[in-house]
């Protein structure tokens, strides 16, 4: 069918609550495109009827709510005037929430379920709630170790929980809860977050900052050698790992046999209040299979990607 396959995302979710995933893939979706969602390579698109439990809402796929049997690979097909991309999203549904039981709970937490607070500082936790405009979210309640959070050190501000004068006792398992309203029906959303405490002074917030790349595409000729730096600022003596990944795998592991794409040796420059880290990715020879694939730079919980793109034909040569 001429569509380029992109294997993008592994999401781990709790059953019995709403979930939405937006099919955005810069730079593909920045122009005039049509987006269609499918499940498990079905030829029949996901319904667009808003009364359906699973339906497409503009570029989103929306589950109201997610159920145990919804696990699987979903594809969103993005068709432009001259292009077609098929993005595969692997959704794994887990039945139980941690505060109900430890059985059948979320295994192997990904970075989005982990957040850091800085000891002695005023800091905050974020409740990640990503839904289309058709979903209205009510005020957020916060829980720690399965009990509702109360006390003057804690303030709820939109999707954030502000924590003043962070102490070691603030580590633990948090959850944020909101009521989502869609087409007159109400649903509960509950997101778990595991929180650790660091003593290091924050620089520019509580997470590493990726200066470059910035989720963009790079035009590069087929067969050329390419080196791309990932530049990260982070606190001094931080314990974050910085690396390049593709398809959720370290590039050195992914290209273990060919060694065609490698991660470089990390270097850093020390400033008074922070460090600037650089770790590069080297493409010894750019191949067709590299185009359109997000190469992700990871720094702790922060990520940014580059996508290689064939240069537009230069008609002046003809």
């Amino acid at each position: 069918d001429g569509c380029k396959d992109i294997f993008m995302k592994n999401e781990i979710l709790s059953a019995s609550q709403p979930f939405a995933f937006n099919c955005t893939f810069p730079p593909i979706t920045s122009g005039e495109v049509s987006v269609t969602w499918y499940k498990n390579s079905s030829k029949i698109p996901v319904s667009k009827i808003i009364q359906s439990r699973i339906h497409q809402d503009e570029t989103w796929i929306l589950f109201l709510p997610m159920e145990w049997g919804d696990s699987g690979v979903y594809q969103c097909v993005i068709k432009g005037r001259d292009s077609c991309h098929r993005i595969h999203v692997n959704l794994t549904v887990f039945e139980k929430h941690w505060c109900d039981t430890s059985i059948g709970g979320l295994p192997n937490l990904s970075d989005e379920y982990k957040q850091i607070l800085h000891l002695g500082k005023d800091d905050s936790l974020t409740c990640h709630l990503h839904f289309p405009k058709s979903c209205v979210l009510g005020p957020i309640k916060w829980y720690k170790d399965c009990n509702e959070i109360k006390g003057e050190r804690f303030t709820v501000l939109e999707t954030r929980l502000l924590v003043s004068n962070v102490s070691a006792e603030d580590r633990g398992n948090y959850a944020c809860q909101a009521i989502l309203t869609h087409s007159g029906k109400q649903y509960e959303v509950l997101n778990g977050i595991t929180v650790s405490i660091t003593e290091r002074a924050g620089y520019g917030g509580s997470v590493p900052k990726i200066i470059y790349p910035k989720n963009h595409s790079i035009e590069v000729q087929l067969g050329t050698t390419l080196i791309v730096d990932c530049n990260v600022t982070d606190t001094k003596d931080n314990t974050n790992l910085r690396c390049w990944r593709v398809n959720n795998t370290l590039v050195d592991d992914y290209y273990d046999e060919s060694k065609r794409i490698r991660e470089g040796v990390e270097t850093h420059v020390s400033f008074r209040e922070h460090n600037l880290y650089t770790v590069n990715i080297t493409f010894l020879e750019v191949k067709m299979e590299d185009y359109g694939l997000p190469f992700m730079c990871h720094a702790g919980v922060s990520t940014a990607y580059i996508i290689l793109q064939l240069p537009a034909p230069d008609f002046r040569a003809y």
């Epitope: 039981t101 059985i103 059948g104 709970g105 979320l106 295994p107 937490l109 170790d145 399965c146």
Partner: antibody, heavy 119, light 108 residues
């Protein structure tokens, strides 16, 4: 380091009750579920149930439902498992074990408490 | 409930030999939720392999786990004297949690 220290061996008569304790140290007691398991002499392991020390929520194996009660005292980081209406086939070693968020397995176990039910 | 059946019940081998322990589930278990524990007489069980194939802290690399769905295997590539013990598989997917009846690995 993480430690789960259980109370000593008990000898009980049929029909009586036994309360086994499990004192936790080296981690935040209220952040992890505590489970209990039974191992009869020369037999395999059998799950009894779990308690969340902060919310006190419990989930029991139906086989033990009605006879088991799990409680905790957060001030001393201790979990308890009480088994009532004891029978001779309750003679076993009872273990507590801890489960962490995002790690659904028993990474830490108590040393075990032998309960002997005999007339 | 999910019933886990381990085979063989007893395995008699000599040090240096390869051991293969099997665990079969009565219904499908996600690989994230299938674990193995080692137990020696008079001791508490000890986590050995978690999530089907990940070795717990300090477990030597001669131990490996594999499998999916209803069939799981614990393999010891070259038996050492300290490996002789009872091994239990366990599922953490649904309540009640269940263990296999154990495989006793004994010196031949």
């Amino acid at each position: 380091q993480v430690q789960l220290v259980q109370s000593g061996a008990e000898v009980k008569k049929p029909g009586a009750s036994v309360k086994v304790s499990c004192k936790a140290s080296g981690y935040t007691f209220t952040s992890s579920w505590m489970h209990w398991a039974k191992q009869a002499p020369g037999q395999g392991l059998e799950w009894i149930g779990e308690i969340h020390p902060n919310s006190a929520k419990t989930n029991y194996n139906q086989k033990f439902q009605g006879r088991v009660t799990m409680t905790r005292d957060t001030s001393i980081s201790t979990a308890y498992m009480e088994l009532s209406r004891l029978r001779s086939d309750d003679t076993a070693v009872y273990y507590c074990a801890r489960v962490d968020y995002g790690k659904p397995w028993f990474a830490y176990w108590g040393q075990g408490t032998l309960v002997t039910v005999s007339s | 409930q999910i019933v886990l059946t381990q085979s063989p019940g007893t395995l008699s081998l000599s040090p240096g030999e390869r051991a293969t322990l099997s665990c079969r589930a009565s219904s499908s278990v996600s690989s994230s939720y299938l674990h193995w524990y080692q137990q020696k007489p008079g001791q508490a069980p000890r986590l050995w392999i978690y999530s089907t194939s990940s070795r717990a802290t300090g477990i030597p690399d001669r131990f490996s786990g594999s499998g999916s769905g209803t069939d799981f295997t614990l393999t010891i590539s070259r038996l050492e004297p300290e490996d002789f013990a009872t091994y239990y598989c366990q599922q953490f997917q649904s309540s009640p949690l269940t263990f296999g009846q154990g495989t006793k690995l004994e010196i031949k």
